[in-house]
């Protein structure tokens, strides 16, 4: 993907720390694009609406993504 002259990535630091799916308000997975050459995962927590960038390579975060997608597939008819 050719990079735009203006990089519009969001995450300055990323966290490896496990996140409890129950404490999540929202989980955004932003795919790599011409504006940002990396995948970004942004968690919005229920408490105070605090946001956190998560490490897509972290085992704990991969497990979180699996848990969230499993939860979603349960909900969808």
């Amino acid at each position: 993907v050719p990079l735009s002259r203006t990089v519009r990535c969001t995450c300055i630091s990323i966290s490896n720390q496990p996140v409890n799916p129950r404490s999540l308000e929202k989980l955004e997975i932003i795919p790599a694009s011409q504006f940002c050459p990396r995948v970004e995962i942004i968690a919005t927590m229920k408490k105070k609406g605090e946001k956190r960038c998560l490490n897509p390579e972290s085992k704990a975060i991969k497990n979180l993504l699996k848990a969230v997608s499993k939860e979603r597939s349960k909900r969808s008819p």
Epitope: C9, C11, I12, S13, I14, R38, R52, C53, N55
Partner: antibody, heavy 120, light 108 residues
Framework: QVQLVDSGGGVVQPGRSLRLSCAAS????????MHWVRQAPGKGLEWVAV????????HYADSVKGRFTITRDNSKNMVHLQMNSLRAEDTAVYYC?????????????WGQGTLVTVSS | EIVLTQSPATLSLSPGERATLSCRAS??????VAWYQQKPGQAPRLLIY???NRATGIPARFSGSGSGTDFTLTISSLEPEDFAIYYC??????????FGQGTKVEIK
């Protein structure tokens, strides 16, 4: 424990260049953004530049834009600040600081600082 | 650019007294303010983040409060090692990240 060691300061003439370095240890360096913050003699703190954990994002204070370049080497746990076209007003102690790893930026660990004096 | 104004510039107090430091932002920064302590010849040290959360290892005598544009750092009972310069910093999610000009807490 987290440790940041700043180096590379010295006396330099106006218009010349200098490269500062910051050696990091005691944490997973390649997941943290890193900043440079400076302090002119007897003055307050001024944020200078940031680089994201992977080097993709770089932001600079207006006062140094186009003259300073921040880089990092994740294989060596190092951050650098290349300072070109130095001016007398760049005279300061330069601190390397670790990003807090939260959504909003603050500086949770600091290096000891390295003094840059720009004088003819 | 968000401007932070600290007051007073200098606070002259005795050990054991209560110190109240103020930081005012030129526009709302929600609760995204941090406080740092700096002693002569040393790097700054993070004390408080998100207006009221103490950083790791910071004694309970340090507390922070406020939201929007007005913030306060309180030292409930000054210890000899607390005499230093204190800076506030706004933690918006885009640069530049600015500091107040500092408040010096000196021994009376």
């Amino acid at each position: 424990q987290v440790q940041l060691v700043d180096s590379g300061g010295g006396v330099v003439q106006p218009g010349r260049s200098l490269r500062l370095s910051c050696a990091a240890s005691g944490f997973t360096f390649n997941t943290y953004g890193m900043h440079w913050v400076r302090q002119a003699p007897g003055k307050g703190l001024e944020w200078v530049a940031v680089i994201s954990y992977d080097g993709i994002i770089k932001h600079y204070a207006d006062s140094v834009k186009g003259r300073f370049t921040i880089t990092r080497d994740n294989s060596k746990n190092m951050v650098h600040l290349q300072m070109n076209s130095l001016r007398a007003e760049d005279t300061a102690v330069y601190y390397c600081a670790r990003d807090s790893s939260s959504w909003y930026v603050y500086f949770d660990y600091w290096g000891q600082g390295t003094l840059v004096t720009v004088s003819s | 650019e968000i401007v932070l104004t600290q007051s007073p510039a200098t606070l002259s107090l005795s050990p054991g007294e209560r110190a109240t430091l103020s930081c005012r932002a030129s526009q709302s920064v929600s609760s995204y303010v941090a406080w740092y302590q700096q002693k002569p010849g040393q790097a700054p040290r993070l004390l408080i983040y998100d207006a009221s959360n103490r950083a790791t290892g910071i004694p309970a005598r340090f507390s922070g409060s406020g939201s929007g544009t007005d913030f306060t750092l309180t030292i409930s009972s000054l210890e000899p090692e607390d005499f230093a310069i204190y800076y506030c910093q706004q933690r918006s999610n885009s640069p530049p990240w600015t500091f107040g000009q500092g408040t010096k807490v000196e021994i009376k």
